[in-house]
């Protein structure tokens, strides 16, 4: 903490501008009415300040205001929103978009993941929903912020909004918010015919359970090998070599190479070896002919 | 050693079918899919298509689908291309080729020797 | 379908001249680019897979390089014997496409 000195009169402040550049830190500290840096905090980011002295501007206003700051001052942090911790910004609320995208476009370049993720969430929570503006927001200034969000947030998304999510803003969600997502994205595509639906749809499924899994394998949709990998574990365990025939198609060829990498892995070793050797690659763990196969846990679930 | 033994020219009137064949050895013919690639004379490589040795299912290049039939004779490990409704621009070389699956869907480390097809009245 | 546009259809060069051949895919195919010579009334021959990982016994004038959609195969010093014509092969769709080809002559 920067101590505390009396601060001289000719240095006394009365507006934010550049000649604030050169005072030490200890003399912004004495000299710098927190009030007015509040009131001014528009000026801030026009001024070359070093990053010690906004240090010290960020400590005056953590001063005045310690159970957050209010949106007036946070749509003008500008480079001051680097300086800010996940822990700052969870004290924020925040509506206004405009404030979103000044924040994010500050924060691009920088390592900021942990904050932007905070901000993102307390502008979820701040407007009650992640409506269709904040998805084009997000979509805009800041492609695959979608997965920051927790899965709780994310199912406050309407499906009338998964319109507007693009394939990359998917690229970095994990399973449990491709959970929430798909049975969202499936209501919102519902309407469309096959090949229009799996072109939407195909983003979302690493959500998808098995059932939808083996209905699109009745639709001629030649799954490409990328979208496969990326299916749940266990939407895939359960689907014949048939199924797995039909829902890639040609792109069955591309399992080879995938065969020592899960789900492909996984799934190879649930299958009958003959059935396998039907795919005409040379795949190999499957369950040798003449072996039966017991599902224990069937067992343990009735006794 | 592997080896893509193709069976010889052939002149064949418009509108007739032909058959290539492609003869496998040296390695496990169900293991690895048979492509077709076609050749015009001083033009490029023209995938045609490919099939599963192991169930027979075949995958064909759109512009051929009506008109191509691949098959193949596990017995002998031969593969075969039919193209039927011959047409003059169809004169080209004919291609097997043998996929390796060192990454993604595959690249064609073996070829057979090539089976040219004259179509001409 | 990929789309793979090829430049340029020919060219003559020296004997130890250096040659660049380039490829454009029309979507991105990651690495999944091979490169083949052909030589008049031959099956053509595997020099490169994955962009550049030069095949056994290929000699190593021959080069690749790109990422995504621009490929570019070198021949660093050019030998009679490369006298031939090259293509590049996209496998990242399991639907194969070749360029048009670059047919190489020396000068």
């Known amino acids: 903490d920067v101590e505390r000195t009396t601060c001289p009169p000719e240095k006394e402040v009365h507006e934010i501008d550049e000649s604030l550049i050169f005072y030490k830190k200890r003399e912004l500290e004495a000299c710098v009415d927190a009030a007015l840096l509040a009131a001014q905090m528009d000026r801030v980011d026009a001024i070359p300040f070093t990053y010690e002295q906004l240090d010290v501007l960020k400590h005056k206003l953590d001063e005045l205001y310690p159970q957050g700051y209010p949106e007036s001052v946070i749509r003008h942090l500008g480079h001051l929103f680097l300086k800010m911790s996940p822990e700052d910004i969870r004290k924020w609320n925040v509506t206004s978009l405009e404030t979103l995208k000044a924040l994010l476009k500050v924060s691009k370049g920088h390592e900021m993941s942990a904050q932007v993720a905070t901000l993102i969430d307390r502008v979820v929570v701040g407007r009650g929903q992640l409506d269709k503006d904040t998805v084009d927001t997000l979509t805009a200034f800041c492609p695959g912020c979608l997965c920051s969000l927790s899965p709780e947030r994310l199912s406050s998304v309407p499906p009338s909004v998964i319109g507007a999510v693009r394939p990359q803003d998917l690229d970095t969600c994990g399973p449990r918010q491709l959970d929430v997502l798909y049975p969202k994205a499936r209501l919102a595509f519902q309407n469309m015919s096959g090949s229009e639906y799996f072109v939407k749809i195909r983003p979302f499924l690493g959500g998808a359970p098995t059932e939808d899994v083996k209905a699109l394998s009745q639709q001629n949709v030649s799954m490409d090998l990328a979208t496969f990998m990326k299916l749940r574990r266990e939407a895939v365990l359960p689907l014949t070599v048939a199924e797995v025939q039909k829902l890639l198609g040609p792109h069955v060829e591309g399992l080879k190479v995938e065969e020592q990498h899960s789900p492909v892995r996984d799934w190879i070793l649930k299958q009958r070896q003959d059935d396998l050797d039907t795919l005409g690659l040379g795949l190999q763990g499957g369950i040798p002919n003449g072996y039966l196969i017991l599902d224990l846990s069937v067992r343990e679930a009735l006794s | 050693e592997v080896q893509l033994v193709q069976s010889g020219a052939e002149v064949k009137k418009p509108g007739a079918s032909v058959k290539v064949s492609c003869k496998a050895s040296?390695?496990?013919?169900?293991?690895?899919?048979m492509h077709w690639v076609r050749q015009a004379p001083g033009q490029g490589l023209e995938w045609m298509g490919n099939?599963?040795?192991?169930?027979?299912?075949?995958y064909y290049n759109e512009r051929f689908r009506s008109r191509v039939t691949m098959t193949v004779d596990k017995s002998t490990s031969t593969a075969y291309m039919e193209l039927s409704s011959l047409r003059s621009e169809d004169t080209a070389v004919y291609y097997c080729?043998?996929?390796?699956?060192?990454?993604?869907?595959?690249?064609?480390?073996?070829w057979g020797q090539g089976t040219t097809v004259t179509v001409s009245s | 379908d990929i789309q793979m546009t090829q430049s340029p259809s020919s060219l003559s060069a020296s004997v130890g001249d250096r040659v660049t051949i380039t490829c454009k895919a029309s979507?991105?195919?990651?690495?999944?680019i091979a490169w083949y010579q052909q030589k008049p009334g031959k099956a053509p021959k595997l020099l490169i897979h994955?962009?550049?990982e030069l095949q056994p016994g290929v000699p190593s004038r021959f080069s690749g390089s790109g990422s995504g959609t621009d490929f570019t195969f070198t021949i660093s010093s050019l030998q009679p014997e490369d006298i031939a014509t090259y293509y590049c092969?996209?496998?990242?769709?399991?639907?194969?496409?070749f360029g048009g080809g670059t047919k190489v002559e020396i000068k």
């Open positions: 080729a043998r996929p390796y699956y060192g990454s993604s869907y595959g690249y064609f480390d073996y």
């Open positions: 040296g390695y496990t013919f169900t293991n690895y899919w």
């Open positions: 099939i599963n040795p192991s169930n027979g299912g075949p």
């Open positions: 979507q991105d195919i990651n690495k999944y």
């Open positions: 994955y962009t550049s």
């Open positions: 092969l996209q496998y990242a769709n399991p639907l194969r496409t």
